[in-house]
């Protein structure tokens, strides 16, 4: 088992909004849960966009999940990762 490296980034979207992207990379096996939580509960699937789980060329995999949020409400969102029985949560950077 190779645990993922998880990185959260933010980028400007429309006025007053930002897109936050959670990337998991260099993990094996390929089964992974990567999702956004808002206010501690599940963020609805229709407000998230997922990338495919793809080989990254080193025998490991990578994927991502993104959502658009209101600027100033970053604290209310965390990216949740679960892989091979391990889990972690990742805040949006300021």
């Amino acid at each position: 088992t190779v645990p993922p490296m998880v990185n959260v980034t933010r980028s400007e979207a429309s006025e007053g909004n930002i897109t936050v992207t959670c990337r998991a990379s260099s993990f094996y096996p390929r089964n992974i849960i990567l999702t956004w939580r808002q206010d501690g509960v599940a963020l609805s699937h229709d407000t998230q966009q997922w990338g495919d789980v793809l080989p990254d060329g080193n025998g490991t995999y990578q994927t991502w999940v993104a959502t658009r949020i209101c600027r100033g409400e970053e604290q209310r969102f965390t990216c949740y990762m679960e892989h091979s029985g391990n889990h972690s949560t990742h805040p949006v950077p300021s």
Epitope: R37, D39, G40, E73, P91
Partner: antibody
């Protein structure tokens, strides 16, 4: 360590308002987290009532929405529960608690305060 | 709202026994589940979060499992301090709801 302490009257008359205070020490309620009220009825059923978060946003249980208000006093690091038009069905032990945004589970609770609604 | 159904409502067990408590959600909660222990006259204490993760300081004789709508809490080699009531709680969506509890008593 975050510590929470509930206070308020132990007896309220039917049709009146129930008002409780949660005093938080060890952490500023404006820094982070969701600050919640949960109650436990005499037969031990637990009910999540609602929260006020670090920025003052509230979220209430729809079963209580027309009767509940959660507010705060940031200068005293306190948050409050008001429940209007109470009946004997609102007799319960009331707890304050908080959760972090990594998941809505409750790591620490206050000691609870029993409120009896009776004429 | 998601309803949480716990079973059994109560059980009697001896010190050293293994007990299992189950919790069923009315919909798929995708492991968004916590377990609490409550002793008489005290506040609930967090035991498990994210369906399987033990909270800080929880003894390893406790374990939890499940997925979808079915979850369980297992206590291996029950100790005197484990007697009390146990509650599950989902955090998939609002409103957050709890199971009705399982009371674990000394046989």
């Amino acid at each position: 360590d975050v510590q929470l302490q509930e206070s308020g009257p132990g007896l309220v008359k039917p049709s009146q308002s129930l008002s409780l205070t949660c005093t938080v020490t060890g952490y500023s309620i404006t820094s982070d987290y969701a600050w919640n009220w949960i109650r436990q009825f005499p037969r031990n059923k637990l009910e999540w009532m609602g929260y006020i978060n670090y920025s003052g946003t509230t979220n209430y249980n729809p079963s209580l929405k027309s009767r509940i208000s959660i507010t705060r006093d940031t200068s005293k690091n306190q948050f409050f529960l008001q429940l209007i038009s109470v009946t004997t069905e609102d007799t319960a032990t009331y707890y304050c608690s908080y959760y972090r945004y990594d998941g809505a589970w409750f790591p620490y609770w206050g000691q609870g305060t029993l409120v009896t609604v009776s004429a | 709202d998601i309803q949480m159904t716990q079973s059994p409502a109560s059980l009697s067990a001896s010190v050293g026994e293994t007990v299992t408590i189950t919790c069923r959600a009315s919909g798929n909660i995708h492991n968004y589940l916590a377990w609490y222990q409550q002793k008489q006259g005290k506040s609930p204490q967090l035991l498990v979060y994210n369906a399987i993760m033990l909270a800080d300081g929880v003894p390893s004789r406790f374990s939890a499992s499940g997925s979808g709508t079915q979850y369980s809490l297992k206590i291996n080699s029950l100790q005197p301090e484990d007697f009390g009531s146990y509650y599950c709680q989902h955090f998939w969506s609002f409103p957050l709801t709890f199971g009705a509890g399982t009371k674990v008593e000394i046989k």
